[in-house]
């Protein structure tokens, strides 16, 4: 496991990053601010009723590259954007839901989801 701030770990930040959190605040957050060794994120996804829900928060360094890659999930419309360039940088992230395609409704059990690419902000 990489130590915080070690020079041998190119992706590790030398200092903690503070992020805005909403619907996704861990116990160690204060005043809707969380802390991480990884990324801030903002995500939009549909809830069970199809209503868009925006959440934001912190992603730890371990596994965050994968989470920020925004791999499409079958039967779920969602998009995530991540950033690290300054504290609370996720206040300025505004991901949008990938558009519904006609074939999402007519293809039966096989859904070809639109792959939304997010942008890393460094």
């Amino acid at each position: 496991k990489k130590e915080d701030g070690e020079s041998t770990a190119p992706t590790a930040r030398p200092k903690v990053l503070r992020c805005k959190c909403h619907h996704h605040c861990p116990e160690d957050s204060v005043n809707n601010i969380c802390s991480t060794d990884g990324y801030c994120f903002t995500m939009i996804e549909e809830d069970d009723s199809g209503t868009p829900v925006v959440t934001s928060g912190c992603l730890g360094l371990e596994g965050s590259d994968f989470q920020c890659r925004d791999t499409p999930i079958p039967h779920q419309r969602r998009s995530i954007e991540c950033c690290t360039e300054r504290n609370e940088c996720n206040k300025d992230l505004h991901p949008t839901l990938p558009p519904l395609k006609d074939r999402d409704f007519v293809d039966g059990p096989i859904h070809h989801k639109h792959h939304h690419h997010h942008h890393h902000h460094h």
Epitope: D4, G5, K15, V16, R18, P26, T36, E62, N87
Partner: antibody
Framework: QVQLQQPGAELVKPGASVKLSCKAS????????MQWVKQRPGQGLEWIGE????????LYNQKFKGKATLTVDTSSSTAYMQLSSLTSEDSAVYFC?????????WGQGTTLTVSS | DVVMTQTPLSLPVSLGDQASISCRSS???????????LHWYLQKPGQSPKLLIY???NRFSGVPDRFSGSGSGTDFTLKISRVEAEDLGVYFC?????????FGSGTKLEIK
């Protein structure tokens, strides 16, 4: 090597304000947070707050909100803490400290005496 | 705020002895990232504190291997295997998991 230089002492009158300085050298100033810690004899260490020199983002201990204001001057790699409306309770040693995920290096501390 | 309780307040030892200092936190110090931000510092008279151990058990650069840290959750220990004269001073534990960051009240290591 990492150095955090602080003036040795400050003498200030009650009700006045004081701006304590902390000059950093030996590392990239904007790559680490700067924290400030208060130490009174027999009272242990108290965390005042922190500032990220890269964007001047601050976090304060609720107890010191309105008392302490943290700023930086990146051109001189210097962090400042202004303390206002001073009383005898503010007499203490104040340390600045470099922080990544924990305090790695401390300044020598400034002894602040509030007295008329 | 997280309260850090250190015991004992004073620890008289003979040179060469082992010393053990306990630090308990009022809530878990496991951060949401999985790290535990519990650290140990030594402050000698008239000096600023110096970092000994970070994140429970990692020795900071230049710290002799007679210093070791252990523990998890809310219960932590600093051990000095063979106390030397230069080890005397006040030891503080500190947490940087929860804002505001807090410190233990200190343990004074002194000669018996």
């Amino acid at each position: 090597q990492v150095q955090l230089q602080q003036p040795g002492a400050e003498l200030v009158k009650p009700g006045a304000s004081v701006k304590l300085s902390c000059k950093a050298s030996g590392y990239t100033f904007t790559s680490y947070w700067m924290q400030w810690v208060k130490q009174r004899p027999g009272q242990g260490l108290e965390w005042i707050g922190e500032i990220d020199p890269s964007d001047s983002y601050t976090l304060y201990n609720q107890k010191f909100k309105g008392k302490a204001t943290l700023t930086v001057d990146t051109s001189s790699s210097t962090a400042y803490m202004q303390l206002s409306s001073l009383t005898s309770e503010d007499s203490a040693v104040y340390f600045c400290a470099r922080f990544g995920y924990y305090i790695e290096y401390w300044g020598q501390g400034t002894t602040l005496t509030v007295s008329s | 705020d997280v309260v850090m309780t250190q015991t004992p307040l004073s620890l008289p030892v003979s040179l060469g002895d082992q010393a053990s200092i306990s630090c308990r936190s009022s809530q878990s110090l496991v951060h949401s990232t999985g790290n535990t931000y519990l650290h140990w510092y030594l402050q000698k008279p008239g000096q600023s504190p110096k970092l000994l151990i970070y994140k429970v058990s990692n020795r900071f650069s230049g710290v002799p291997d007679r210093f070791s840290g252990s523990g998890s959750g809310t219960d932590f220990t600093l051990k000095i295997s063979r106390v030397e004269a230069e080890d005397l001073g006040v030891y503080f534990c500190s947490q940087s998991t929860h804002v505001p960051f807090t410190f233990g009240s200190g343990t004074k290591l002194e000669i018996k």
